[in-house]
């Protein structure tokens, strides 16, 4: 990617944050070894990465969770990378699913999502999970980011 | 990314190598369909990718392993992407965890890690696992790389 | 990456398509929220991404599948990212393996593959799986793409 005023590097990497909120949208923070290249990408309300420039972006998320088959619903644990663009419907960009473990008290598993998508100015991306209480927030386990091509 | 003497492409992709060493740090080699763009990134001692230029890098690792719940410790299999910078603390950048399988003799699972991080000149990244003897070294199963934005 | 006639952005992201074919090669389509930057990368026969320019590419695939240990073969589910270059042998770039779940009727799991590779003009990449009938084609679950550095 080019460095320069015309075409600066745009990249972000944020770290998961435990939340008391009951929402399925994961919370993130600029803490630890985070990346926020400049104000052309911002973390809004601790929940979404918002870009100012149109273009192609590689967007990724990693979620580690700990669950048990007996204690969880029948449905698998699903992580979804979603897009919100001004004046458009929200949409799912990527999803991954893992069946709960039989390990006790719970079994850890990690999910990685990533892909190239066109984002409009003001577009936001966020990560949804089926059960945020199962997400692991230890160092490096759960993170979210993007880079502009 | 720009091509040119001023801002050459910097990228690497190395292939896992079985090792008799007892260390938890995985070993890598420039073999098979590997990538080493130029001398601005190097594989040192078969264990770490070291960069000469400061900047933002997308760093990734994939580890496939085969383990069995009864034959392994209670703790899950964990893969960690770690950073060593001159005069700084070593640090965990990314981690993924998978509970051992109940399949016999062992059950294969794959982990993928990836994220954007600022690296300083002379910084090195390496991959740690809880049990290197469980790692699968068949073609394409376990690899490690980076690219400079 | 540079924008301009000399060095345009090259990127693709395609979406899985269920297929009645008995081949192990996954089928893809330009549908939903897909990406196809220009004609320097094309989706050929719904099965492979073909590039016109030589260079380093980050190539990735995500496959979600649903399988059961009793109903499947002993062998794990394996996803392979493969390369076909003009006048060369096909080769495996990346593989991931997951042992089948004991969940009934089947347990979902997701695999992510990604790495940096040098591609020649006319090179094609495609994704092979051990059992295409087990692949999940719901929105966002299974996708395939690349970006030129």
């Amino acid at each position: 990617m080019q460095k320069g005023d015309q075409n600066p590097q745009i990249a972000a990497h944020v770290i998961s944050e435990a939340s008391s909120k009951t929402t399925s949208v994961l919370q993130w923070a600029e803490k630890g070894y985070y990346t926020m290249s400049n104000n052309l990408v911002t973390l809004e309300n601790g929940k979404q990465l918002t870009v100012k420039r149109q273009g192609l972006y590689y967007i990724y998320a990693q979620v580690t969770f700990c669950s048990n088959r007996e204690a969880s619903s029948q449905a698998p644990f699903i992580a979804s990378l979603c897009l919100k663009s001004p004046g458009r419907f929200e949409r799912i960009l990527l999803r991954a699913a893992n069946t709960h473990s039989s390990a006790k008290p719970c079994g850890q598993q990690s999910i990685h999502l990533g892909g190239v998508f066109e984002l409009q100015p003001g577009a936001s991306v966020f990560v949804n999970v089926t059960d945020p209480s199962q997400v692991s927030h230890g160092t490096g386990f759960t993170s979210f980011g993007l880079l502009k091509l | 990314m720009q091509k040119g003497d001023q801002n050459p492409q910097i990228a690497a992709h190395v292939i896992s190598e079985a090792s008799s060493k007892t260390t938890s740090v995985l070993q890598w080699a420039e073999k098979g369909y590997y990538t080493m763009s130029n001398n601005l990134v190097t594989l040192e001692n078969g264990k770490q990718l070291t960069v000469k230029r400061q900047g933002l890098y997308y760093i990734y690792a994939q580890v496939t392993f085969c383990s069995n719940r009864e034959a392994s410790s209670q703790a899950p299999f964990i893969a960690s992407l770690c950073l060593k910078s001159p005069g700084r603390f070593e640090r965990i950048l990314l981690r993924a965890a998978n509970t051992h399988s109940s399949a016999k003799p062992c059950g294969q699972q794959s982990i993928h890690l990836g994220g954007v991080f600022e690296l300083q000149p002379g910084a090195s990244v390496f991959v740690n696992v809880t049990d290197p003897s469980q790692v699968s070294h068949g073609t394409g199963f376990t690899s490690f790389g980076l690219l400079k934005l | 990456m540079q924008k301009g006639d000399q060095n345009p952005q090259i990127a693709a992201h395609v979406i899985s398509e269920a297929s009645s074919k008995t081949t192990s090669v996954l089928q893809w389509a330009e549908k939903g929220y897909y990406t196809m930057s220009n004609n320097l990368v094309t989706l050929e026969n719904g099965k492979q991404l073909t590039v016109k320019r030589q260079g380093l590419y980050y190539i990735y695939a995500q496959v979600t599948f649903c399988s059961n240990r009793e109903a499947s073969s002993q062998a794990p589910f394996i996803a392979s990212l493969c390369l076909k270059s003009p006048g060369r042998f096909e080769r495996i770039l990346l593989r991931a393996a997951n042992t089948h779940s004991s969940a009934k009727p089947c347990g979902q799991q997701s695999i992510h593959l990604g790495g940096v590779f040098e591609l020649q003009p006319g090179a094609s990449v495609f994704v092979n799986v051990t059992d295409p009938s087990q692949v999940s084609h719901g929105t966002g679950f299974t996708s395939f793409g690349l970006l030129k550095l």
Partner: nanobody
């Protein structure tokens, strides 16, 4: 700013043990990690061990793995380095360091440092 005071250094025979302590005061709520570096005579300062405050994750230099253990007592705002099976090559001044909480990957923030404590391993 964080103030760090080390203690526990001294002379020990090869194969012996020592426990170093590092007491933190000041802006301790801003600490992301605490750890140890060492500097032998005529050599550069090198990383020894670190413990991260978020979840107690630890990392060690290859040269001390299996012999040294870092730990922290948050109630006392103190980090410890238990050094076992000491070797003559472990002889150095050991420095405690603290990394501020908001040190993102593009910010090479300054660490806060202690004054150092000398460890000598000799028969």
């Amino acid at each position: 700013e964080v103030q760090l005071v080390e203690s526990g250094g001294g002379l020990v025979q090869p194969g012996g043990s020592l426990r170093l302590s590092c007491a933190a005061s000041g802006s301790i709520d801003r600490i992301n990690a605490m750890g140890w570096f060492r500097q032998a005579p005529g050599k550069e300062r090198e990383f020894v061990a670190v413990i991260y405050s978020s979840d107690g994750s630890t990392l060690y230099a290859d040269s001390v793995k299996g012999r040294f253990t870092i730990s922290a007592d948050n109630s006392k705002n103190t980090a410890y380095l238990q050094m076992n099976s000491l070797k003559p090559e472990d002889t150095a001044v050991y420095y405690c360091a603290a990394e501020p909480y908001g040190s993102g990957s593009s910010l090479i923030s300054e660490y806060d440092w202690g004054q150092g404590t000398l460890v000598t391993v000799s028969s």
